[in-house]
């Protein structure tokens, strides 16, 4: 006999990276008939929602109107049907950005390289941080971690046309509190025409996660898109 219900899905809309003082919605999708959902934050109960009517709703949304460093961290949710509770969802890492300062991103030997060349990004931030994050724009938001007192280097190795795209970096004050994003650096990788045509910027995930993040940054608009990013989420753990 089943002792627990299947775990729900959890994600953040429009993005798990939230500029401070902006809003974010945490979504939890369980089953029709669930009478209560609980959102937990760092192991403590954060919020409760009781859908009405439960038999017609399988997803709830928890609204955070004013993101700050106290609310950055790991979230999970559970739901209840009758007296039976579900397994907890996977962890959602909610990150607050635009904290303190703006790093500088540079690339060596330069932003225009030939396929096969070795490329290194440098992210510099003079304030107290030792962890840096390099993100490539696009749905998959490829994230790399680097460490250093005021600067981290991110060697990409011999590049291919798949490395083409726009990069930004963050300084990280802890796993869930990041600086303002750096100015973007666009990497152009030239190769033979055949390869170039077969290598769009981000072939696996064409939807633009970064665009959604920028929309949040600039206007605070909410978008009803499930853009939770597994690549970056896993890297945070």
């Amino acid at each position: 006999q089943q002792q627990t219900l299947p775990k729900p899905f959890i994600w953040a809309e429009p993005h798990f990276m939230v500029p401070k003082e902006k809003q974010v919605t945490i979504c939890c999708q369980g089953n029709y008939g669930a009478v209560e959902y609980q959102l937990h934050f760092e192991g403590s109960l954060f919020a409760v929602d009781r859908p009405k009517p439960p038999e017609r709703i399988n997803k709830v949304k928890f609204y955070i109107p004013d993101m700050n460093s106290r609310m950055a961290g790991q979230y999970s949710c559970i739901y209840r049907v009758g007296e039976l509770w579900s397994e907890p969802s996977n962890l959602l890492d909610l990150v607050v950005t635009e904290m303190y300062d703006t790093p500088t991103l540079s690339v060596h030997p330069g932003p225009e390289v030939i396929s096969g060349e070795k490329v290194t990004f440098y992210c510099r931030l003079d304030t107290a941080t030792s962890m840096f994050l390099l993100l490539k724009e696009g749905r998959s938001s490829h994230v790399q971690r680097g460490y250093g007192k005021v600067q981290a280097e991110f060697p990409l190795g011999p590049v291919t046309t798949a490395h083409r795209g726009t990069y930004r970096c963050f300084g990280s004050y802890n796993n869930h509190a990041w600086s303002f994003p750096s100015e973007p650096v666009k990497l152009l990788v030239t190769g033979d025409i055949e390869n170039t045509s077969l290598a769009p910027e981000d072939p696996t995930f064409p939807a633009d996660t970064w665009g959604t993040y920028l929309l949040t940054t600039e206007t605070g608009l909410q978008k009803d898109h499930a853009l939770w990013d597994h690549t970056a989420q896993n890297l945070l753990r």
Epitope: A47, Y63, P65
Partner: nanobody, 127 residues
Framework: EVQLVESGGGEVQPGGSLRLSCAAS????????MGWFRQAPGKEREFVAA????????YYADSVKGRFTISRDNAKNTVYLQMSSLRAEDTAVYYC????????????????????WGQGTLVTVKP
């Protein structure tokens, strides 16, 4: 901007009752989830009770369940905390808090979620 003003605190004997009120200014009260927290001398602020924006769903700390009742009157922009069977351990400064705006059924338990706070009202329970 939301301003919250608590009232109704005072001294009461064990087993007695009090009703706290929290008056909210501004037109946003109907879109606010509300909560009560308390802080006893030398202790951390703790959750007491909360109520959702629209349907009036409620949630209580185990320590007050069955003794305290939270309610709201959207016409009066006021949230109430009816406290009965009071005990010495209920002695604390009671704070009203709001999350504005929010979805209809959300009930917030964690203090970090609340973006507006009142100044507090003191409740003392002693013989």
């Amino acid at each position: 901007e939301v301003q919250l003003v608590e009232s109704g605190g005072g001294e009461v004997q064990p087993g007695g009752s009090l009703r706290l009120s929290c008056a909210a200014s501004g037109r946003t009260f109907a879109s606010a989830a509300m909560g009560w927290f308390r802080q006893a001398p030398g202790k951390e602020r703790e959750f007491v009770a909360a109520i959702s924006r629209s349907v009036g769903d409620t949630y209580y700390a185990d320590s007050v369940k069955g003794r305290f009742t939270i309610s709201r009157d959207n016409a009066k922009n006021t949230v109430y905390l009816q406290m009965s069977s009071l005990r010495a351990e209920d002695t604390a400064v009671y704070y009203c808090a709001a999350v504005v705006p929010t979805y209809g059924n959300n009930i917030y338990v964690h203090s970090a979620a609340y973006n507006y706070w009142g100044q507090g009202t003191l409740v003392t329970v002693k013989p």
